[in-house]
């Protein structure tokens, strides 16, 4: 769509395109399956405009339909991942608080290999928290070009 | 300066246990996976366990999977590795060592080694 | 689990001399993740080369690595005297995480 000279003036947040590319901090400790995310410029190419990060989850600041990603490479990974663990390897992407909205959103399986990469179009409202949980013995790269995690507004 | 200093080796008969340490120092302990490799008289490296900076996952080679446990104390900087069930072949130098921060297990600095002798 | 083979099991050279050292996987590595390390008697591994070819932090510029899929190489471009060792590669790319057993580089 066509922008007036007035809204190109605006800075992005005001015109609702919040987006948001996360870069992985850490695991979390036994009996928490969360991954912990950063985002800034002084660590690379990651960055928050609009949501925000609430110890390492990301909080959504405005309702709307984003476009969510992520993908997940294992530093350590064995070829025969899933045959090896008697528990499902599988990443699981979503909204973790309010616990009213609580919903997967995205579901992954290690089938074998050692990467995994999805996104989905979903509705999104403002204070969702979303957690991209870890399910098994995993070890995942912090290489940015490995493991990121992102959000981008896309209507209302 | 990054230091790892292991320590618990000794000798030992088959079927003992033995618990080895290893004091980190110089880095923020918390953020690095570290690993357990160790080296036969005269023989190749071998890897045997890794740990996850949080703790929250743990990985063992074939051959002391269910004898070794790996575990980390962040409050205190230091790697633990209980060996249990020990053999005459588990006779070796056992190295910490710590991962390069994206977690890949190629070993960035190493400490100087714990002799463990397994003997009757 | 992957093998890595090194060859050759010694190498007698004279400093100044150029060192090619191979290393042979039995499947190919997932990402040229490989790295090599130096180890001098009674001491600890230090590492020298990861993802084959990035050289570590404080590594002198005679070492490099390079190589892909199953045949990677260190080369020691000039021999220094403090560079007779023994030298060993590491597969990273799947669990368990394997090495070679070793490359003696020695003085003629």
């Known amino acids: 769509q066509r922008l007036s000279r007035a809204q190109q003036q605006l800075p992005l947040e005001s015109l609702g395109w919040d987006i948001a590319e996360l870069q992985l901090n850490h695991t979390g400790p036994q009996q928490d399956p969360r991954l912990y995310w950063q985002g800034g410029p002084a660590l690379g190419r990651s960055f928050l405009r609009g949501p925000e990060l609430d110890k390492g989850q990301l909080r959504i600041r405005r309702d709307g339909i984003y476009m969510v990603h992520i993908q997940v490479t294992l530093a350590i990974c064995s070829s025969t991942s899933t045959s090896r663990h008697h528990h499902p390897t599988t990443l699981a992407v979503g909204i973790c608080s309010p616990a009213s909205r609580s919903i997967s959103l995205l579901r992954l399986s290690f089938h074998q290999g050692c990467t995994i990469a999805s996104q989905r179009l979903t509705p999104l409202a403002r204070g969702d928290t979303l957690c991209t949980n870890l399910t098994g013995t995993l070890l995942p790269s912090r290489n940015t070009d490995e493991t990121f995690f992102g959000v981008q507004w896309v209507r209302p | 300066e990054v230091q790892l200093l292991e320590s618990g080796g000794g000798l030992v008969q088959p079927g003992g246990s033995l618990r080895l340490s290893c004091a980190a120092s110089?880095?923020?302990?918390?953020?690095?996976?570290m690993s357990w490799v160790r080296q036969a008289p005269g023989k190749c490296l071998e890897w045997v366990s890794a740990?996850?900076?949080?703790?929250?996952?743990?990985f063992y080679a074939e051959s002391v999977q269910g004898r070794f446990t790996i575990s980390r104390d962040n409050s205190k900087n230091t790697l633990y590795l209980q060996v249990n069930s020990l053999r005459a072949e588990d006779t070796a130098v056992y190295y910490c060592?710590?991962?390069?921060?994206?977690?890949?297990?190629?070993?960035?600095?190493w400490g100087q080694g714990t002799l463990v002798t397994v003997s009757s | 689990e992957i093998v890595l083979t090194q060859s050759p099991g010694t190498l007698s050279l004279s400093p100044g001399e150029r060192a090619t050292l191979s290393c042979r996987a039995s499947?190919?590595?997932?990402?040229?993740?490989l790295a090599w390390y130096q180890q001098k008697p009674g001491q600890a591994p230090r590492l020298l080369i990861y993802?084959?070819?990035s050289r570590a932090t404080g590594i002198p510029d005679r070492f490099s690595g390079s190589g892909s899929g199953t045949d990677f190489t260190l080369t020691i471009s000039r021999l220094e005297p403090e560079d007779f060792a023994v030298y060993y590669c590491?597969?990273?790319?799947?669990?368990?995480?394997?090495f070679g057993c070793g490359t003696k580089v020695e003085i003629k």
């Open positions: 499947q190919s590595v997932r990402g040229n993740y």
């Open positions: 110089g880095f923020t302990f918390s953020s690095y996976a």
């Open positions: 993802g084959a070819s």
């Open positions: 060592a710590r991962h390069d921060y994206s977690n890949y297990p190629y070993f960035d600095y």
């Open positions: 740990i996850s900076g949080s703790g929250g996952s743990t």
């Open positions: 590491q597969q990273y790319g799947y669990s368990p995480f394997t």
